[in-house]
Interface confidence: low
């Protein structure tokens, strides 16, 4: 056997090159046949009425043919025949790759409660061979469950991801990434997770600066409440007592001028948003006017309440971003 060919893999719509090579030539006729065993070329003559086949090279040692605008129907075995005695035959297999036509993420629901499992589906349509779908949450790879549907030699792959959502997922993209031999680099689409959570409350003493509250001094407390959405209500209350008459409330700030011992107690900043409520307590102790040995400073304690965290999903589809996954992993 001195007739050789090589298998060809080509992307749909591109050009396939078929080569029949003879090692020891004796000027025998070389013929190329299609999968239906119709003659495409007999030496340098093309009897087949398909102008997509063009002769690239013809000699006693090689018949080289190009096939333009390859379609999936062109797939199969192409036969090279060498008219020696006895005749020799070798075949080359043309494999046509079809990239996925479309990549879509479908989310079961727009909002989800933290701790709940949501279903995310990604579909890569009409590819050949079947597409491999990979899932990432940020830079962490997750496992999806894929189902393949075949129709007319083409494959539609749907991958289902069951994702348990957490507050920490806020702003993290869920990425559906496609790997396919007909796609250079990574084809991907993603959704950014937006997590809503109850406020986190922190009280800061902005006056006095040294943190020691004495009779006759002024006190200024600022309540910082961070949540998503931003807390709509920030209120000050005095726990188990009325707010002093000389206390001034201004938004997140609490001012108490001319402190006296009757002001001792716990002052609570409460914040709420649509998700839930939280609070932080400041325990005020008013000390005597200055002495030689300063007593210990006042303390702040924070308490939060158990509430529900909501997740909202915002769409942001991007395709063909290469190298976007490697960057970070933990």
């Amino acid at each position: 056997q001195n007739l050789f060919t090589k298998d060809v893999t080509v992307i749909e719509g591109e050009v396939a090159t078929i080569s029949c090579q003879v090692n020891k030539s004796d000027d025998s006729v070389i013929q190329l046949l299609n999968p239906n065993r119709q003659t495409i070329y007999f030496r340098d003559f093309r009897p087949l009425k398909d102008s997509r086949f063009q002769l690239l090279n013809f000699s006693s040692s090689e018949l080289k043919v190009s096939l333009t605008n390859v379609s999936i129907s062109d797939e199969g075995r192409y036969f090279c025949q060498l008219y020696t005695d006895p005749p020799q035959e070798s075949y080359t297999t043309i494999t046509v790759l079809v990239p996925p036509r479309n990549l879509m993420i479908d989310i079961q629901k727009d909002t989800a409660v933290e701790g709940e499992e949501i279903e995310v589906n990604c579909t890569a349509m009409a590819s050949k061979p079947a597409t491999t779908i990979r899932w990432f949450k940020g830079n962490t790879e997750l496992k999806g469950k894929s189902e393949v549907e075949e129709w007319s030699d083409m494959y539609t792959v749907t991958s289902q991801l069951m994702l348990k959502v957490h507050k920490e997922d806020d702003g993290v993209p869920v990425i559906c990434q496609v790997e396919h031999p007909a796609v250079t680099g990574n084809l991907q689409t993603q959704r950014y997770l937006e997590v809503q959570y109850k406020p986190q409350v922190h009280i800061q003493m902005t006056y006095p600066l040294q943190g020691l509250t004495r009779e006759g001094d002024a006190l200024e407390l600022t309540c910082e409440a961070i949540g998503k959405p931003q807390p709509v209500m920030v209120t000050w209350v005095r726990v188990d007592d009325e707010m002093p008459q000389h206390a001034v409330l201004s938004g997140p700030n609490l001012f108490i001028n001319n402190l006296n011992k009757t002001d001792n107690g716990t002052y609570r900043c409460e914040a709420s948003n649509i998700v839930g409520k939280a609070h932080s307590d400041y325990m005020l102790y008013v000390y005597d006017p200055p002495t030689t040995i300063p007593p210990p400073t006042t303390t702040t304690t924070t308490t939060t309440t158990t509430t529900t965290t909501i997740l909202t999903i915002i769409t942001d589809s991007r395709a063909g971003e290469e190298g976007s996954i490697r960057a970070v992993d933990h």
Epitope: N139, T140, E141, L142, K164, R326, A327, V328, D329, H330
Partner: antibody, heavy 111, light 107 residues
């Protein structure tokens, strides 16, 4: 040759500090997340810390959080682990490892 | 906090098949990888992505996962396969976790 080579291990008193280094060669260091994994004598493997390819993100096991610091110098192809406030239970062979979401290359370790 | 559990030790006759299992809830969500560690040596990756084998790893090593259990199978165990095998995955925060490991003895 693709390899990782750790150094910097040694004997240290409780409360002391050590800095481990891991020199990478034979691959594009700046493209890979890197890790430290340790193994106490006669025990199993324990993940210690991770760092992203750029160095922008770091993660630590609870057992070392606040005491150990992972860092990298991509211009020198080197990974570091600064270990402070060392305890007897930190005694182990420390391996540096490379990978995406699994460890596909390991160093020989430093004790 | 997720945990992975493996049998501490398993024995196999030379040329026979041995299956090591690793159980944990994280295996429902995250890929498992398996590492071989011979005495006095660094670990070596033998299986990743549940069932993919790195180049250079003999095809007698294979992996699979069903629900919360990952398995490493050595078909036709050789003397050089005697080692500790560790399963690795992620916890709920995405941090790596290793199982305690299984010592495989080839008889």
């Amino acid at each position: 040759e693709v390899q990782l080579l750790e150094s910097g291990g040694g004997l240290v008193q409780p409360g002391g500090s050590l800095r481990l280094s891991c020199a990478a060669s034979g691959f594009t260091f700046s493209r890979y997340p890197m890790y430290w994994v340790r193994q106490a004598p006669g025990k199993g493997l324990e993940w210690v810390s991770s760092i992203s390819s750029s160095g922008g993100l770091t993660h630590y096991a609870d057992s070392v959080k606040g005491r150990f610091t992972i860092s990298r110098d991509n211009s020198k192809n080197t990974l570091y682990l600064q270990m402070n406030s060392l305890r007897a239970e930190d005694t182990a062979v420390y391996y540096c490892a490379r990978g995406d979401w699994y460890f596909d290359l390991w160093g020989r370790g430093t004790l | 906090q997720y945990e992975l559990t493996q049998d501490p030790a398993v024995s196999v006759a030379l040329g026979q098949t041995v299956r090591i299992t690793c159980q944990g809830d994280s295996l429902r969500t995250y890929y498992a990888s398996w590492y071989q560690q011979r005495p006095g040596q660094a670990p070596v990756l033998v299986i990743y992505g549940d069932n993919d084998r790195p180049s250079g790893i003999p095809d007698r090593f294979s992996g699979s996962t069903s629900r919360n259990t990952a398995s490493l199978t050595i078909t036709g165990a050789q003397a050089e396969d005697e080692a500790h095998y560790y399963c690795n995955s992620r916890d709920s925060s995405g941090n790596h976790i290793f199982a305690t490991g299984t010592k495989v003895t080839v008889l």
